[in-house]
Structures are given as C-alpha cells and as structure tokens.
Interface confidence: medium
Amino acid sequence: VTGSRVYPANEVTLLDSRSVQGELGWIASPLEGGWEEVSIMDEKNTPIRTYQVCNVMEPSQNNWLRTDWITREGAQRVYIEIKFTLRDCNSLPGVMGTCKETFNLYYYESDNDKERFIRENQFVKIDTIAADESFTQVDIGDRIMKLNTEIRDVGPLSKKGFYLAFQDVGACIALVSVRVFYKKCPLTVRNLAQFPDTITGADTSSLVEVRGSCVNNSEE
C-alpha cells in the first residue's frame, strides 16, 4: 500500500487512487450517511485517501460510490485491483442480521466523461467481492490493518471510457486502493524483426496479430 508504486512493465495503469494528489472526490449516493472519503496515515505518516462505510446496524443499505470517468485508451479488457479492509461482523458489538461481509463491483461504459449522477440501472455488475482468507497486514500507525486484495477483469469494452461503482449493502468496509489497468505485450525483437507495444485482446486467451518491422540495418 505504501511507498513508491512499481507495477509490471506489461501493465498500463488507467487509474490509481493512491497516485491522486489531494481528495479523490468521487461521487457518493446518498450524498451523506453512506460512503465517506477519509484520510488515514500510513507508518510513514503519509496520508492515504480511502472511502469507508460502516452502517452495519441499519437494514436495507444501498450505498453507491462511483469513480471519475476512466479512459480505456484502446484497451478492450481492463483489470480492476481493489485493496480493502472489511470488518468481520462477529467482531462488531451488538450487530444482528443487518451486518454484511461483502460489497458489489459494477461498471458502466460511456463516451461522456462528465456524468454527474449515479444511475444505478445503467451499471452492469462485475462481481460480489468478499474478504479472502489471505490478506496482508499493513501498519497504519497505531494499529495493524488487514488488507485484502481482489482483482477482477471486464471486457470487451467498446466506448471511449467507463465508470466503476462500488455498492455497499451493509458492510463495515474501507476501500484503501483502487487501481485500473490493462495489459500489453511489450515491444519485442525476434529474428531481426521488431514488434511494437500491443494491447491484449478482448479475451484473456485471444491472439492479436501485429505487423512487425525490420530492425535498423536489416531488410525484409
């Protein structure tokens, strides 16, 4: 979570909430009483912008959080990496059947980069996200935070960009990091032929044909 963020060379980042300077300013619905942007400090006293919600005592929760518009840069399939911490309902005092331990991830393709409102029916569900058994422990100053990491992919995409949304249905959760990226095959030289950076196809297994060129001082 902390320190410089170095990602594999074949991954191109479209959104990294940890790289945003200042407030993220994503859109929440309802405006109050649902997701809230909260700054926490890591062990190096660096602020981490997180979104959290913890309405575990109230029934029928439906709290939405939407990112800003994300350009797809020609990618047909994108990957969403979410780092989050989710409280175990059994660890909370007094909670009954209202407490949940999952949240939902959605996306909505759009050519409009300035949509102001969340229209729930426009969003397509990607998956229900639960806390995995495996987690990393992160020091956030005066206590250790259990950090789960989940990666989902979505595609094929066709519009200029898209929005991501997170739906809370009554969990005690903090989104600590959201990263969206696509994968590419990096520039490759084979047998004096050079093949450029190439974005992967719509499916994880699809082959993309790309025209190469001769390296300098060589001919076809």
């Epitope: 913890c54 005592m57 409280r87 909370l92 005092p93 007094g94």
Partner: antibody, heavy 125, light 107 residues
Framework: QVQLKQSGPSLVQPSQSLSITCTVS????????VHWVRQSPGKGLEWLGV???????DYNAAFMSRLSITKDNSKSQVFFKMNSLQADDTAIYYC???????????????????WGQGTSVTVSS | DIQMTQSPSSLSASLGERVSLTCRAS??????LSWLQQKPDGTIKRLIY???TLDSGVPKRFSGSRSGSDYSLTISSLESEDFADYYC?????????FGAGTKLELK
C-alpha cells in the same frame, strides 16, 4: 462544539404521552445516531432506544409498544415520544450522541460520547 | 439481557487518595464497556470507552482496565471535582445496560 439541548414538559398526567425534543449542534444527524436513556430512583439508568443516522430505529423491547423516535435532519432535531405514562415513568430523560463506529477504530456504536442536559419528568395528576 | 454488577455502591475517600470501582458482566462483552461520570446537577460525561481508552480532555488520573469479566475504573489521586456518581455501560449487545452506579463521596 458538540451540544444536545433538550426541551419538553416537566409534568405529565397519567395515561398521557410525553414528547421531548433534542436539538443538536456541532454534528450532523446524517452522520451520527442519537440514543435515549432515562434515569429513575427505582431502576437506575435504562436504555430506551436509538435512531440511527439513516433514520431506522431500535428500541428496548420493554418499551417498544409505546415508544417512537423520529427526527428532522434539516432542523437537527430528534423527537422522542412515549405513550401511556404511569407514575413509575417518572424519571430524568436524556438524549445522547452515538460515538461513530469506524472501520479502523473500535469507538463502539453505542458508546454515547455526548449527553444532553436531561429533562426531569414527573408523572402525576 | 446482560447484567452489569457494579461495586461498591458508595465509597468515601479523601483528596489525593487512589480509588477503584468495578463492574462485572454476566456475559462476555469483549471489552465493549464505557465509564460515565454524573455530576450532582445531572450532567453526564463519558470518561472511558472500549474498557481502557481515555476520552479526549479527560485527566490522566483516570484509567480503565479489564481482567476477564471484571472491568475497573481507577482514579489515581482524587481531586475535588471527582466526587460524583460513576456508571459503567456495556454496549456489546441489545439492550444496552448500565451498572447501578457508585457514589463517590468526600470523607
């Protein structure tokens, strides 16, 4: 700073209802719930109920049939109403702010961190 | 309902003295306990939450601790403004329940 100011009658006739208003400042009712507690010489402190920040309520089963807690977020007011009062409902009634439960810190939902000044209510004819 | 048994019900002590009050929970409350102070005018103030965490602005002479199902509030050196009624509150489960209180008086 956080304040809870209560207003309501000091005398209620038997079988009548009690209405108390808790007007809050220094925090928003859309972010914090408000609890109600009473204190009587015979039974000590008793938790009556709570209205959560989303507007849903939870009541002590012993009072559920005659208790109603509502609020007006825009006016920062919480309304407490108890019906069919009898002499043993004579008590000091308090509203108290919920200490928000966090993802990282166990502040505890019910651990009321700020209290109103109390409304002393006598049930008598 | 969880019963909170508080002792002693009253306590006479002198200025500068160290005193301890105890609450015992009838069921497991996992440290979800607060200590409250009530002054003679009826004003209630929270001193401690989560069994041992001091509220901001509360003097360091107040401390909370836990030993199994027993929870204690200790005042290390009594000052004149500490003479009041003290209550424990469990917030582990519905309904929330309080101890019967301890009246701390000047000897």
């Amino acid at each position: 700073q956080v304040q809870l100011k209560q207003s309501g009658p000091s005398l209620v006739q038997p079988s009548q209802s009690l209405s108390i208003t808790c007007t809050v400042s220094g925090f928003s009712l859309t972010r914090y719930g408000v609890h109600w507690v009473r204190q009587s010489p015979g039974k000590g402190l008793e938790w009556l109920g709570v209205i959560w920040r989303g507007g849903s309520t939870d009541y002590n089963a012993a009072f559920m049939s005659r208790l109603s807690i509502t609020k007006d977020n825009s006016k920062s007011q919480v309304f407490f109403k108890m019906n069919s009062l009898q002499a043993d409902d004579t008590a000091i009634y308090y509203c108290a702010k919920e200490s928000l439960f966090g993802v990282y810190y166990d502040y505890g939902y019910y651990s009321m961190d700020y209290w109103g000044q109390g409304t002393s209510v006598t049930v008598s004819s | 309902d969880i019963q909170m048994t508080q002792s002693p019900s009253s306590l006479s002590a002198s200025l500068g003295e160290r005193v301890s009050l105890t609450c015992r929970a009838s069921q497991e409350i996992s440290g979800y306990l607060s200590w409250l102070q009530q002054k003679p005018d009826g004003t209630i103030k929270r001193l401690i939450y989560a069994a041992s965490t001091l509220d901001s602005g509360v003097p360091k002479r107040f401390s909370g601790s836990r030993s199994g199902s027993d929870y204690s509030l200790t005042i290390s050196s009594l000052e004149s403004e500490d003479f009041a009624d003290y209550y424990c509150l469990q917030y582990a489960s519905y309904p929330l329940t309080f101890g019967a209180g301890t009246k701390l008086e000047l000897k």
